[in-house]
């Protein structure tokens, strides 16, 4: 007897973080034997949507013409082949921004920081919120932090970073949210440019030194203060 059908791949274009009113396309890719694709949304009646496969039958498109609160959430997809339904895909978390007013992002003591020292990014909201998210432009893992103060409403969140290295430099934004839906975020804060100057680093070349300047896990503050990461929006904890 054959084993279970391999799970499909689920992704969103242009991405999984979408501003209110913008369009998004959800793709589910299975196998060439797929006859039908099904998309389920957590806490919604299943199936949320069904689609026939696009030629050559190995994927289906689910379109959202205008992003609203109703579409934000956690999705999984399946495909049906002649032998039955596949395993579920890994979840896709579709996040809508623009649900609340934008917070303010600042750097303490300054956005100009010397390599080898520390900097704390402070995200402040006008109204009390319980979840704050920090993102870095062009990062390999753009959603850096989800933090929750165990339901406690606060006006700010601190994101400590140390030691700062050259890859921490770049443009950051933050979002705020309420715990009842981790998929609804505020408008983004105005961008904050973090500039890393000087160097306390070893000047000798390292044989394993990365030549890529793209921001990756290396520039990510991995332990948000006082937080217990939620399952939703979790991007880079182990």
């Amino acid at each position: 007897q054959a084993g279970p059908l391999p799970k499909p791949t689920l992704w969103a274009e242009p991405g999984s973080v979408i501003s209110w009113g913008n369009s998004v396309t959800i793709w589910c890719q299975g196998t060439l034997e797929a006859r039908e694709y099904r998309l389920d949304k957590e806490e919604s009646p299943a199936p949320w949507d069904r689609q026939n496969p696009l030629e050559p039958k190995n994927k289906a498109r689910f379109s959202i013409p205008s992003m609203t609160e109703d579409y934000a959430g956690r999705y999984r997809c399946y495909y049906r082949s002649p032998v039955g339904w596949s395993q579920p895909s890994d979840p896709l978390e579709l996040v809508m921004t623009g649900a609340y007013s934008k917070p303010t992002l600042s750097a303490l003591p300054s956005p100009l920081v010397t390599s080898g020292k520390s900097v704390t990014l402070l995200c402040q909201s006008r109204s009390p919120m319980d979840t704050f998210l920090l993102i870095k432009e062009r990062a390999a893992h753009p959603l850096l932090h989800l933090r929750s103060e165990h339901g406690a409403q606060q006006h700010q969140a601190e994101f400590p970073m140390s030691p700062v290295t050259s890859v921490h430099g770049g443009t950051y934004r933050c979002f705020s949210s309420h715990g009842f839906s981790h998929y609804l975020l505020s408008h983004p804060s105005d961008p904050l440019e973090l500039i890393v100057s000087g160097s306390l680093e070893d000047p000798r070349p390292s044989p394993t030194r990365s030549v890529s300047t793209a921001a990756g896990p290396e520039d990510q503050p991995l332990m948000p203060t006082g937080s217990v990461p939620h399952s939703g929006l979790r991007r880079h904890w182990e």
């Epitope: 303490l108 003591p109 390599s115 080898g116 020292k117 520390s118 704390t120 601190e158 400590p160 970073m161 140390s162 030691p163 290295t165 050259s166 890859v167 306390l200 680093e201 070893d202 000798r204 390292s206 394993t208 030194r209 990365s210 890529s212 990756g216 896990p217 290396e218 990510q220 503050p221 991995l222 332990m223 203060t225 880079h236 182990e238």
Partner: antibody, heavy 118, light 107 residues
Framework: EVHLVESGGGLVQPGGSRKLSCAAS????????MHWVRQPPEKGLEWVAY????????YYADTVKGRFTISRDNPKNTLFLQMTSLRSEDTAMYYC???????????WGQGTSVTVSS | DIQMTQTTSSLSASLGDRVTISCRTS??????LNWYQQKPDGTVKLLIY???KLHSGVPSRFSGSGSGTDYSLTISNLDQEDIATYFC?????????FGGGTKLEIK
């Protein structure tokens, strides 16, 4: 579960060399900066070196700069400390530790002992 | 380098006591202060990071506070398993530096 296991310690003559290894498991090694910290007998902890997750940033304590080299092999989940021109004051228990990105070291190995003596 | 001073090198207390260990830094470290526990067998564990944040799995009887140059670790309701040496460490500026340690013993 995060697990760090150091190896490579032992008795070394003054002026000699030694390479320590730290095998990591239970987490995505390539996503974390790593440290070496040492503790001389009956003394406190002393930070030795740091290497960022992609090896693009490396820092040393002044006491070891020019003599020690920290490196890592991400595909093999292994951290290294190459020690040369060893001195009696380098005698210590050497620990590897995982960096958090917030100035702390959240998981430590059990340590490997290095004795520099003739 | 930032100097770290733990003025009390050893401390004796009774089970159930509330114990406070102090750490002073030579300059403002902006709350980048961490506390570690080293057991007699050499095992080192992170207890508190960023002054007051409890590391996962650490009992809630441990707490941290402070700002600027003065920080403290408090153990409420001292337990037998808390017998260890406690080190503070600043993570504000490399090189990272440790306090000399405070050895906690049971009366």
């Amino acid at each position: 579960e995060v697990h760090l296991v150091e190896s490579g310690g032992g008795l070394v003559q003054p002026g000699g060399s030694r390479k320590l290894s730290c095998a990591a498991s239970g987490f995505t090694f390539s996503s974390f900066g790593m440290h070496w910290v040492r503790q001389p007998p009956e003394k406190g902890l002393e930070w030795v070196a740091y290497i960022s997750s992609g090896s693009s940033s490396i820092y040393y304590a002044d006491t070891v700069k020019g003599r020690f080299t920290i490196s890592r092999d991400n595909p093999k989940n292994t951290l290294f400390l190459q020690m040369t021109s060893l001195r009696s004051e380098d005698t210590a228990m050497y620990y590897c530790a995982r960096g958090t990105g917030t100035g702390a070291m959240d998981y430590w190995g059990q340590g490997t002992s290095v004795t520099v003596s003739s | 380098d930032i100097q770290m001073t733990q003025t009390t090198s050893s401390l004796s207390a009774s089970l159930g006591d509330r114990v406070t260990i102090s750490c002073r830094t030579s300059q403002d470290i902006s709350n980048y202060l961490n506390w570690y526990q080293q057991k007699p067998d050499g095992t080192v564990k992170l207890l508190i990071y960023y002054t007051s944040k409890l590391h996962s799995g650490v009992p809630s009887r441990f707490s941290g506070s402070g700002s600027g140059t003065d920080y403290s670790l408090t153990i409420s309701n001292l337990d037998q398993e808390d017998i260890a040496t406690y080190f503070c460490q600043q993570g504000n500026t490399l090189p990272w530096t440790f306090g000399g340690g405070t050895k906690l013993e049971i009366k």
